[in-house]
């Protein structure tokens, strides 16, 4: 278990306990309960109050991070008396030993890399372990392939993202023979951490007066349809003076991705490249390979 739990309670205790794997807070059921509520308070004094489970003697916290330390609290009224109990959930271990600079990104539609740095006060023998839990099924994924630096795990590579949902809980635990290591946890949205590939199948066809650029939307991990994409086209005239402005064109995603622009013959040599983003986030992909059209003597 990754932390010490300290109970602050009156004489007749509710025996409050917290399971960090399931994020479930439970207590001993009291006869003739008329009212019960549970909540947590974090270090910034933010209060999170989940719905009570049907049996009213437990509650599950869905989207919380615990590494800064939290205090759980349970209030129960029965027809005879009232109960109140606090449960301190500190992040035990030496300050500054937890993994830091944690980040993840999804790429190539079905791969993910997470990286972190060793805590500044972590001993030389520290070892970190990454666990991921999805929001739907609460299934735990253990890191299958660690990235190492001098034997210490400082990253993780996943090539099977089937266990992830749209929002996931990431936990980096640490161990050492010398001292207790603090944990780090984070909630990440897959849509915010995905880096798209550039659009594929980019083609340019020209007639005497116009050029038509077509492309296919990139394959993504997220389930996105055509209106969920935004594109940017960089139409560039070759052999122009350095510092000349490129023409950047914004195009909304459509069922048939195309951009038609006037370009009469004879036309100078041009290149076009395209990048893609989620329309809501605009986290741009890298540019596609430049496609050339026109002629040097245009």
């Amino acid at each position: 278990e990754k932390s010490d739990l300290r109970t602050v309670a009156p004489a007749s205790s509710l025996n409050v306990r917290f399971d960090s794997r399931t994020m479930n807070l439970s207590w001993d059921c009291q006869e003739n309960t008329t009212f019960s509520k549970c909540f947590l308070t974090d270090k910034k004094n933010r209060v999170v109050e989940p719905r009570l489970s049907n049996n009213e003697c437990s509650c599950t916290f869905r989207e919380i991070c615990l590494h800064e330390g939290v205090t759980f609290e349970v209030h129960v009224n029965t027809s005879q008396r009232g109960f109140q109990q606090k449960l301190l959930y500190p992040n035990s271990g030496r300050e500054g030993t937890a993994a830091q600079n944690f980040s993840c990104f999804i790429y190539n539609a079905d791969l993910m890399n997470c990286t972190w740095a060793r805590g500044p006060t972590a001993p030389r023998d520290v070892q970190y372990f990454l666990y991921i839990r999805n929001s739907k099924r609460r299934r735990e994924i253990r890191c299958p392939y660690y990235i190492q630096d001098s034997g210490t795990h400082v990253g993780c590579h996943l090539d099977n993202l089937s266990g992830l949902t749209s929002r996931n809980y990431f936990l980096v635990n640490g161990t050492s023979r010398e001292i207790g290591i603090q944990f780090f946890d984070s909630l990440l949205d897959t849509k915010k951490i995905e880096r798209f590939n550039p659009p594929s199948n980019v083609t340019v066809r020209c007639n005497t007066t116009h050029c038509l650029v077509r492309w296919k939307q990139p394959r993504t991990y997220q389930k996105l349809s055509y209106l969920d994409f935004q594109y940017q086209l960089d139409v560039h005239r070759k052999n122009t003076q350095p510092g000349t402005e490129n023409l950047l064109i914004n195009v909304s995603g459509d069922l048939e991705n195309r951009y038609n622009f006037p370009s009469s013959e004879p036309r100078a040599k041009h290149s076009v490249k395209i990048r893609a983003a989620d329309v809501r986030i605009l986290n741009w992909s890298s540019w596609s390979e430049a496609i050339e059209f026109g002629s040097d003597d245009g």
Epitope: K223, S225, L255, E256, R280
Partner: antibody, heavy 120, light 111 residues
């Protein structure tokens, strides 16, 4: 240009079944998420179901579960809606549509609708 | 009874601005799921006007705009024209129903 061409109007007796088709032209059905929505003067628009990429299967509205079947024949780019045990309050215009955005499910292209009348 | 609540009708003179509200709950608009708006002219299929709360598909004039806040959304039509006379519907996804939900529709009349 993408078009959704629906089958013609139907008149059915209570208890019968109806099958409405939706032929996609200008794009491959296998790349699309087709949903069915019906409209009545009293209840307005009611979503019936369609392909949900998150679940990777066709999902149905709870109120139609057990009575509705949606199928697709990708070889001829045609989607089908079958509604069984018809009642008089199933009298409606039935539309097929393409989901243009999975965020909130925005229905972009629509068929012209198929009028289904249930009457004894 | 529609899951999303809209006024049954609004009206305005040509050139004026009208707004249509759409009120939902914490399981749909407030969840937060994106809101779409549709225009339906008499005897025709609906046409997508707005998606992603405030984005217009190509071909929809910028006289149509929309916004979303909390569990409500609204559609605004500026410079009202005679051919804007139609029924307007809001739509979103609802997690408790695991499906799409619509508003009851608002009839816009140009005086």
């Amino acid at each position: 240009q993408v078009q959704l061409v629906q089958s013609g109007a139907e008149v059915k007796k209570p208890g019968a079944s109806v099958k409405v088709s939706c032929k996609i032209s200008g794009h491959s059905l296998s790349e699309l998420s087709i949903h069915w929505v019906r409209q009545t003067p009293t209840k307005g628009f009611e979503w019936m179901g369609g392909f949900d990429p998150e679940e990777n299967e066709i999902v149905y509205a709870q109120r139609f579960q057990g009575r509705v079947t949606m199928t697709e024949d990708t070889s001829i780019d045609t989607a089908y809606l079958t509604l069984s045990s018809l009642r008089s309050d199933d009298t409606a215009v039935y539309y097929c549509s393409i989901v243009g955005s999975f965020s909130g499910w925005a229905f972009d292209y629509w068929g012209k609708g198929t009028m289904v009348t249930v009457s004894s | 009874q529609a899951v999303l609540t809209q006024p049954s009708s609004v009206s305005g003179a040509p050139g004026q601005r009208v707004t249509i509200s759409c009120t939902g709950s914490g399981s749909n608009i407030g969840a937060p799921y994106d809101v779409s708006w549709y225009q339906q002219l008499p005897g025709t299929a609906p046409k997508l006007l707005i998606y992603h709360n405030n984005k217009r598909p190509s071909g929809v004039p910028d006289r149509f705009s929309a916004s979303k806040s909390g569990t409500s959304a609204s559609l605004a039509i500026t410079g009202l024209q005679a051919d804007d006379e139609a029924d307007y519907y809001c739509q979103s996804y609802d997690s408790s129903l695991s499906g799409s939900v619509f508003g009851g529709g608002t009839k816009v009349t140009v005086l």
